[in-house]
């Protein structure tokens, strides 16, 4: 006996009460795969989530975080609190960069500059709590016989910079 | 650290009003949902309804006919009113926060025993 | 409205030994689900919250998986301290809904 489940498109289920008819899926579900016996109940987005996009009978609706916040987790199953560029998420709450790191994000943890020595070169602009160190040529490029058609900045280590 | 501490008439009489209040100590009251949920030995935990600090609710659908959750923001405290109570309303009630990352509940009151009997 | 069931009701396991507590949903939930621990005469703590995320200063030895409609608490050494009921908690959809709990003894 062939099943005739397997005919029902996305957006419908399989009613057997009725005789294996495809039964469009009732308000507030869906049903994103054809040959559904059942239709999942729609997500809602609240408390801490808002609606990205609105459930329709194909495909479940989909949640952000409200503002503040940010979104983490497989579909946004969570969300985390934004922190200011140059600071980092703490148990207790943002805490700025230490120094010496930098995050240039609204979220993740504060990374270290980068150390331009390891690749021969010297800092060409030092690193605050919000941007990394940008390097520059190595120290020997800079000698005098080097050839340079604009002199470079001069250049500081890190440890200088303001904070 | 945040804490809740509640408080409210323990023992009811058949069709009287329950009436709890939960008290909200440290932390950031206004930007936060604040949960009821109640907990019987034949039901388990059963989640009552919420409020935020504007006042919005989400109510159980099957409380929501005798149910009313008020907020007093100016006291950082939160209300629970449950009418015409029967035995089956018999339980611990808990007050407790929605945390900042997700719909779940990371700070919880002590527990009132509410006991409903003639 | 959404139906979480915890079976077995009580779990038996020796101190050292890992302790496996399936939680089912009636239908699929992404990963909006949390776990509670309840001991004797206290509040449910939250333990785990987006199926698998530890909240603060819950030990290591607490784990989560799964996603959609079956989930799993792991507690991977189990110490005396870990005797209590455990729920699961869905998030997906309003009414928020509590699995029925599993308890966990000394064998």
């Known amino acids: 006996l062939q099943d005739l489940c397997s005919n029902c498109p996305a957006g419908t289920f399989c009613d057997n009460n009725r005789s294996q008819i495809c039964s469009p899926c009732p308000p507030n579900s869906f049903s994103s795969a054809g040959g559904q016996r059942t239709c999942d109940i729609c997500r809602q987005c609240k408390g801490v989530f808002k609606t990205r996009k609105e459930c329709s009978s194909t495909s479940n609706a989909e949640c952000d975080c409200i503002s503040g916040y940010h979104c983490l987790g497989a579909e946004c199953s969570m969300c985390e609190q934004d922190c200011k560029q140059g600071q980092e998420l703490t148990k207790k709450g943002c805490k700025d960069c230490c120094f010496g790191t930098f995050n240039d994000q609204k979220r993740g943890i504060c990374r270290p500059w980068t150390n331009c020595s390891l690749d021969g070169k010297s800092v060409l602009v030092n690193g605050t709590k919000e941007r990394d160190v940008v390097c520059g040529p190595s120290p020997a490029d800079l000698s005098p016989g080097a050839s340079s058609a604009t002199p470079p900045a001069p250049a500081r280590e890190p440890g200088h910079s303001p904070q | 650290q945040v804490q809740l501490q509640q408080w409210g008439a323990g023992l009811l009489k058949p069709s009287e009003t329950l009436s709890l209040t939960c008290g909200v100590y440290g932390g950031s009251f206004s930007t936060n949902y604040w949960s009821w949920i109640r907990q019987s030995p034949g039901k388990g935990l059963e989640w009552i309804g919420e409020?935020?600090?504007?006042?919005?609710?989400e109510y159980n659908p099957s409380l929501k006919s005798r149910l009313t959750i008020s907020i007093d923001t100016s006291k950082n405290q939160f209300s629970l009113k449950l009418t015409s109570v029967t035995a089956a309303d018999t339980a611990v009630y808990y007050c407790a926060r929605m945390g900042y990352h997700s719909p779940s509940f990371d700070f919880w009151g002590q527990g009132v025993l509410v006991t409903v009997s003639s | 409205k959404i139906v979480m069931t915890q079976s077995p009701a009580t779990l038996s396991v020796s101190p050292g030994e890992r302790a496996t507590l399936p939680c089912r949903v009636s239908q699929g939930i992404g990963s909006n689900l949390a776990w509670y621990q309840q001991k004797p005469g206290q509040a449910p703590r939250l333990l785990i919250y987006g199926a698998s995320t530890r909240a603060t200063g819950v030990p290591a030895r607490f784990s989560g998986s799964g996603s959609g409609s079956e989930f799993t608490l792991t507690i991977s050494s189990l110490q005396s301290e870990d005797l209590a009921l455990y729920y699961c908690q869905q998030y997906n959809n309003w009414p928020l809904t509590f699995g029925g709990g599993t308890k966990v003894e000394i064998k």
């Open positions: 409020i935020n600090h504007s006042g919005n609710t």
